[in-house]
Structure formats: structure tokens, C-alpha cells
Interface confidence: medium
């Protein structure tokens, strides 16, 4: 089940998945001047069994100017290549979540992929929060959020984190700081008071992917 909601917004914080639950989709996006080949995959999918998970499909990009040549890299789940992008890198990982059953590692890059990766999370996905540069983490609990299914709706739990504007580098994500009240409401596992603004029912479901989600083919 896709999470039809965004993880919570924490002021002056960003978040990251350390590993991806089976069912997660990663768009096959190409950098400027390149495009997906017509017969190529639209997305990669984290699949697997109880003992091993890996990314299905290959992302293939070809020059927009050429029609014949394709560049591709077959994703190897065991391979952990460094991605040289402008994205923030976490100083440490809380757990080697990629070694957990039912999770895929960050896929290695493919040739001419876009500079940013677009993921679509599923129920059970966990993301970890970190204060942006120049802000310090204050939290009384885990700086993480999990996508859960509650009463037929998906929701993300509220991370117990606030970021203060003190010029001090925060450790990520388990550094203990003085207690402070987190922004936002505490999560209630039993509450069923759900409004349409909390959870928007989306029509974009994996079952209708070919017909309703993906539109025109590149020429």
C-alpha cells in the first residue's frame, strides 16, 4: 500500500530513508539532455522474499538527440556506490536497515540519471530526521517517522524533534539533547478522528499505474 501522505514537516529539518521497504517505487528519471528509452522501465521496484530483497527493473537513459544508443547499469542490491550529488549526506546511519529483511538498499546510480531521486513510499517505511546546517537538535524521543495504516488510512507518526537556531552541528540521528516539547501534536495510536485534510485519498494506485498515472510517452 502506497503512503498517500507526506512525512511530517519539521521546521529547519530534513529527512531521509536509510533503506526502502518492499513495494517502494523509484522513478527512472534522466538528467537534462537525456530521456528514458521508449521500451525502458518507468520505475524500479523493491521486491523480494523473506531472505532477500532487490530492485526489479532497470532504469535506462539515452541521449535526447540519439535514438539508438542506450546507457544502462544493472542495479545490484549488494552494491553500495557513492552518489555524488548536492544532497546532504548523513554523518552516520542509525542502523544498517538495508540488512533487515524486506528492505532494499539505496540503488546504485545508473548512467545519466537525474540529480535527484523520486521515491514513492509504502506502509511501514521509516524516515529519519536531521536538523539542517546551523540548527541544533532538541528531542525527547526518536527523530524518525513511520508510515502506518490506521483505520484504513495511511499516516506518518510524529517525530519527537525540534531544531533550534544555535550554530552547532547536530549528530544524526540519536544524539541526546535537553528535553523540549516537540512541534506538532503527539501521535495517538487509538484516535480515529480523521479529517480529509489529514489524509487525502489518492487515485494514484499501483494497480492503475499504466492507465492513470503515466501519461504521454516521450517522442
Amino acid at each position: 500500500e502506497l503512503c498517500d501522505d507526506d512525512p511530517p514537516e519539521i521546521p529547519h529539518a530534513t529527512f531521509k530513508a536509510m533503506a526502502y521497504k518492499e513495494g517502494t517505487m523509484l522513478n527512472c528519471e534522466c538528467k537534462r539532455g537525456f530521456r528514458r528509452i521508449k521500451s525502458g522501465s518507468l520505475y524500479m521496484l523493491c521486491t523480494g522474499n523473506s531472505s532477500h530483497s532487490s530492485w526489479d527493473n532497470q532504469c535506462q537513459c539515452t541521449s535526447s538527440a540519439t535514438r539508438n544508443t542506450t546507457k544502462q547499469v544493472t542495479p545490484q542490491p549488494e552494491e553500495q556506490k557513492e552518489r555524488k550529488t548536492t544532497e546532504m549526506q548523513s554523518p552516520m546511519q542509525p542502523v544498517d536497515q538495508a540488512s533487515l529483511p524486506g528492505h532494499c538498499r539505496e540503488p546504485p546510480p545508473w548512467e545519466n540519471e537525474a540529480t535527484e531521486r523520486i521515491y514513492h513510499f509504502v506502509v511501514g517505511q521509516m524516515v529519519y530526521y536531521q536538523c539542517v546546517q546551523g540548527y541544533r537538535a532538541l528531542h525527547r524521543g526518536p527523530a524518525e517517522s513511520v508510515c502506518k495504516m490506521t483505520h484504513g488510512k495511511t499516516r506518518w507518526t510524529q517525530p519527537q524533534l525540534i531544531c533550534t537556531g544555535e550554530m552547532e552541528t547536530s549528530q544524526f540521528p540519536g544524539e541526546e539533547k535537553p528535553q523540549a516539547s516537540p512541534e506538532g501534536r503527539p501521535e495517538s495510536e487509538t484516535s480515529c478522528l480523521v479529517t480529509t485534510t489529514d489524509f487525502q485519498i489518492q487515485t494514484e494506485m499501483a494497480a492503475t499505474m499504466e492507465t492513470s498515472i503515466f501519461t504521454t510517452e516521450y517522442q
Epitope: 507526506d6 514537516e9 523520486i118 514513492h120
Partner: nanobody
């Protein structure tokens, strides 16, 4: 990649309402994109108006339009809207729709800086007369 086309611009009297639309197309998931509206008055910088996260969970507005403008989106129609109420002459500008991709690494759900948006529409003119 996504292509953006704005519509709904035109002339309106001060205090009136206008609804702008921005239709997205491209071979991708529309919910991959955070969306925003910017505006540019003659001889001025392109300024942030409002933004909305990929599922509509989060919105952010410029102080000058708070409580007057509302941004929303319909992922089934691949469209983002800007409802402009109680318009003022200073709202006169070319309004641009913009999109940014969600990254697999650290990201924030709502972005407000124009440099953070990779995709732009051609713009639609809004004129508010007093």
C-alpha cells in the same frame, strides 16, 4: 520531466476573485512533484506566492497573500490551482507555476525559494484594476 501550462489569468477589479490553473504533463508520476506559484511584476524580481507538497498535506504562503490566496492540487487531474480572493492592484503580475522533484535523500516537504524549482511554466498575466 514535467511540462507546465498555466491558464485562468485575466483582468479583475480590486476585491474580486480569480482562479488560476496549472496543468502538468509528462511521462511520470504527478505526485512526484511539489508545486508552487510565483509572480513577477514589471521591473521586479520573481517572487514566491505559495507552495504545496506533493499530496497537498503542506502549504506555505508569502505574507502578502496569506488569508487571501489558497493553493490546492488535484493529483487525479495533474493540476495545481491558485484561488485569488480579495485581490489588490499590487497583485498585478505574470503568475508562474513551478515544480520541483522530491529527492531520495534529505528534503523538505515545502520549498519557497525559486532556485529550488527545476520546472517552470510560461506564465499567465493577472491584472487587478482599482
Amino acid at each position: 520531466q514535467v511540462q507546465l501550462v498555466e491558464s485562468g489569468g485575466g483582468s479583475v477589479q480590486a476585491g474580486g476573485s480569480l482562479r488560476l490553473s496549472c496543468a502538468a504533463s509528462g511521462r511520470t508520476l504527478y505526485s512526484s512533484y511539489g508545486m508552487a506559484w510565483f509572480r513577477q511584476a514589471p521591473g521586479k524580481e520573481r517572487d514566491f506566492v505559495g507552495s504545496i507538497s506533493r499530496y497537498g498535506t503542506y502549504t506555505s504562503y508569502a505574507d502578502s497573500v496569506k488569508d487571501r490566496f489558497t493553493i490546492s492540487r488535484d493529483n487525479a487531474k495533474s493540476t495545481v490551482y491558485l484561488q485569488m480572493n480579495n485581490t489588490k492592484p499590487e497583485d498585478t503580475a505574470v503568475y508562474y507555476c513551478a515544480a520541483y522533484t522530491y529527492s531520495g535523500s534529505f528534503y523538505s516537504a515545502v520549498k519557497t525559494h525559486r532556485d529550488e524549482y527545476q520546472y517552470w511554466g510560461q506564465g499567465t498575466q493577472v491584472t487587478v484594476s482599482s
